[in-house]
């Protein structure tokens, strides 16, 4: 199908195809195109979709920060995903940040957890 | 012969809210992502949010985010600006166009949105 | 966001003349998502090219487009006298859609 058809202001330009909306939605690693004729690919490594959709521009991919390392690469269809550097961690309350780990436990208190990309060492009480 | 025709500028005080309306005729509505794009007096022009042809997906430029919601009606054919907490740097002639990414090949012929005191 | 940036700011041509006005984008932008308008004082916009090339309906061939990447180039062979306006290039290749600044062609 050429854009003539479809618009009688713009003439065909090339364009990925990939497949027909199915019910007015792409599937995942697409986006729907303006007149809603067409499913178009996102860019691997640059953008993402990750479920069915009417979006008219894929997700753009997360890039890890310094101190972060790429666990896993931003697909068409799925998300970079970044985890903090070893000896750092993110807590929840503030997940924009890799906060460095207690190197150890103060004194009374014993190491129970070493530190991951999750959580920041974890000590107890020594019993007497 | 496609037309979009735009409607609800005025003069508001800031802080104030206005609606506007862009109706569509003489293309299918509901299959077309639309926009709204502005121009402040003298200025260039500035897009200002967009929606998909099913309304399931919209998007703001950071400017208006959190303030003004597009949204479309597809069984009237027509396409609408909710303004809120208006500013001053919100004047502007405000355009409904068709499209978004591959060019806005049809345009309303705008409406003036005074934001004042 | 991608930034596009025109020149030169104002082109002073004769009717006759041949102009050309430059969109240099911050970040590659595809072809397929470039697009020119032309503007007169008190009117919409109007899209003269899209897909960085492609004439929309009802342009004169006087008006091409051309380039890729991060430099595109709309080209007027002759300037007819209501070909002075303001010219836009615009983009969508990533959200925000965004316009260059406009370059202003009038009458030297």
């Known amino acids: 199908i050429t854009r003539q058809s479809l618009d009688p202001q713009r003439r065909a330009a090339p364009q990925q195809k990939r497949s027909s909306p199915t019910e007015g939605l792409c599937p995942p690693g697409h986006h729907i195109s303006e007149d809603s004729r067409e499913c178009i690919s996102c860019k691997y490594g640059q953008d993402y979709s990750t479920h069915w959709n009417d979006f008219l521009f894929c997700l753009r991919c997360t890039k890890c920060d310094s101190g972060e390392v790429e666990v896993n690469s931003c697909t068409t269809t799925r998300n970079t995903v970044c985890q903090c550097e070893e000896g750092t961690f993110r807590e929840e309350d503030s997940p924009e940040i890799c906060r460095k780990c207690r190197t150890g436990c103060p004194r009374g208190m014993v190491k129970v957890k070493d530190c991951t990309p999750w959580s920041d060492i974890e000590c107890v009480h020594k019993e007497s | 012969e496609v037309q979009l025709l735009e409607s609800g500028g005025g003069l508001v005080q800031p802080g104030g809210s206005l609606r506007l309306s862009c109706a569509a005729s003489g293309f299918t509505f509901s299959s077309y992502a639309m926009s709204w794009v502005r121009q402040a007096p003298g200025k260039g022009l500035e897009w200002v949010s967009a929606i998909s042809g099913s309304g399931g997906s919209t998007y703001y430029a950071d400017s208006v985010k959190g303030r003004f919601t597009i949204s479309r009606d597809n069984s009237k054919n027509t396409l609408y600006l909710q303004m809120n907490s208006l500013r001053a740097e919100d004047t502007a002639v405000y355009y409904c166009?068709?499209?978004?990414?591959?060019?806005?090949?049809?345009w309303g012929q705008g409406t003036l949105v005074t934001v004042s005191s | 966001e991608i930034v596009l940036t025109q020149s030169p700011g104002t082109l002073s041509l004769s009717p006759g003349e041949r102009a050309t006005l430059s969109c240099r984008a911050s970040?590659?932008?595809?072809?397929?998502?470039l697009a020119w308008y032309q503007q007169k004082p008190g009117q919409a916009p109007r899209l003269l090219i899209y897909?960085?090339?492609s004439r929309a309906t009802g342009i004169p061939d006087r008006f091409s487009g051309s380039g890729s990447g991060t430099d595109f180039t709309l080209t007027i062979s002759r300037l007819e006298p209501e070909d002075f306006a303001v010219y836009y290039c615009?983009?969508?290749?990533?959200?925000?859609?965004?316009f260059g600044q406009g370059t202003k062609v009038e009458i030297k």
């Open positions: 615009q983009q969508g290749e990533s959200p925000p859609p965004t």
């Open positions: 166009a068709k499209g978004v990414r591959k060019g806005f090949d049809y």
């Open positions: 970040q590659s932008v595809s072809s397929s998502y």
């Open positions: 897909g960085a090339s």
